[in-house]
Interface confidence: medium
Amino acid sequence: NFPRTVMVNLNIHNRNTNTNPKRSSDYYDRSTSPWNLHRNEDPERYPSVIWEAKCRHLGCINADGNVDYHMNSVPIQQEILVLRREPPHSPNSFRLEKILVSVGCTCVTPIVHHVA
Amino acid sequence: NFPRTVMVNLNIHNRNTNTNPKRSSDYYDRSTSPWNLHRNEDPERYPSVIWEAKCRHLGCINADGNVDYHMNSVPIQQEILVLRREPPHSPNSFRLEKILVSVGCTCVTPIVHHVA
């Protein structure tokens, strides 16, 4: 059960025990549904910089390195929490905000409604 | 520039303009790198419930519906911010925490180190 307004310490504790600094960093290029990463910056938000994935193709890359047009590259999206300065430009007052971000792309078999 | 401790309104504002309630919801099953979603619950954290993706196969699903072991299903991971009660069980005092979550899976060409 959560109160409406709370005190938050912004001194971030990083619980990532994954010591591999690359993590998913090069998957965007090696994936069969490759994506580009776009920087989204907003000084009124914390974190102020968020990276958004945009799928490169409508189709997916096949074994020959060509686009397979019978498949679809689709974004994997996630709702994340950010802090929004409220009122605007406020130095130490924020509101929790839920935003939808595209984290990467995956290749799916499309649902196709064939003509009878 | 952010101060160390701030006031945060937990009355979440949802900025998701995407009106499609399905979003990525069935991609986990239709992807060539399908995944299962596991519930991770922690009452000391806000949000207390986070869903973690786990890839179903080491390989990827091919056009025949079989696993192709020449490819790899890999998790797409993202660092997200959560609030952790600090001190523990505190009703209105939190600390920002960064955690790594797997959002979904994508199919990649593996990096293969051939023997000379």
Epitope: H57, L58, Y69, N72, V74, H113, H114 | N20
Partner: nanobody, 134 residues
């Protein structure tokens, strides 16, 4: 030479109608998802409508909420042309309208993303100006 050419843009009063055409040359539109996008002065380009390929899908149409019920996208395979019929035009519909083509089939779930992000489209036209003014 492969190209898309838009036409039909004009000055029209609020409430009026226009039909835009997008003619393809050098390739057949049957295999392509076709989208209409627009860019208003000082704004980012946004998707308006798209229609799926007909060679491996059903050629169904998808629209953004702001134009649903007012705009209709259609294709004439014999003429290798896609149309955007725009009715009940509003001042905020003023923009340069572009058509774009990307080969493939489209998942209904992907249509909205296609219109928002436009992927890396295979072909773009140069645009036609639609001005809605009283």
């Amino acid at each position: 030479q492969v190209q898309l050419v838009e036409s039909g843009g004009d000055l029209v009063q609020p409430g009026g109608s226009l039909r835009l055409s997008c003619a393809a040359s050098g390739f057949t539109l049957d295999d392509y998802v076709i989208g209409w996008f627009r860019q208003a002065p000082g704004k980012e380009r946004e998707g308006v409508a798209c229609i799926s390929s007909i060679s491996n899908s059903d050629g169904r149409a998808y629209y953004v909420d702001s134009v649903k019920g007012r705009f209709t996208i259609s294709r004439d395979n014999a003429k290798n042309t896609v149309y955007l019929q725009m009715n009940s035009l509003k001042l905020e519909d003023t923009a340069v309208y572009y058509c774009a083509a990307e080969r493939g089939r489209i998942d209904p779930d992907v249509a909205g993303y296609f219109l928002r992000e436009s992927y890396v489209m295979d072909y773009w036209g140069n645009g036609t100006l639609v001005t809605v003014s009283s």
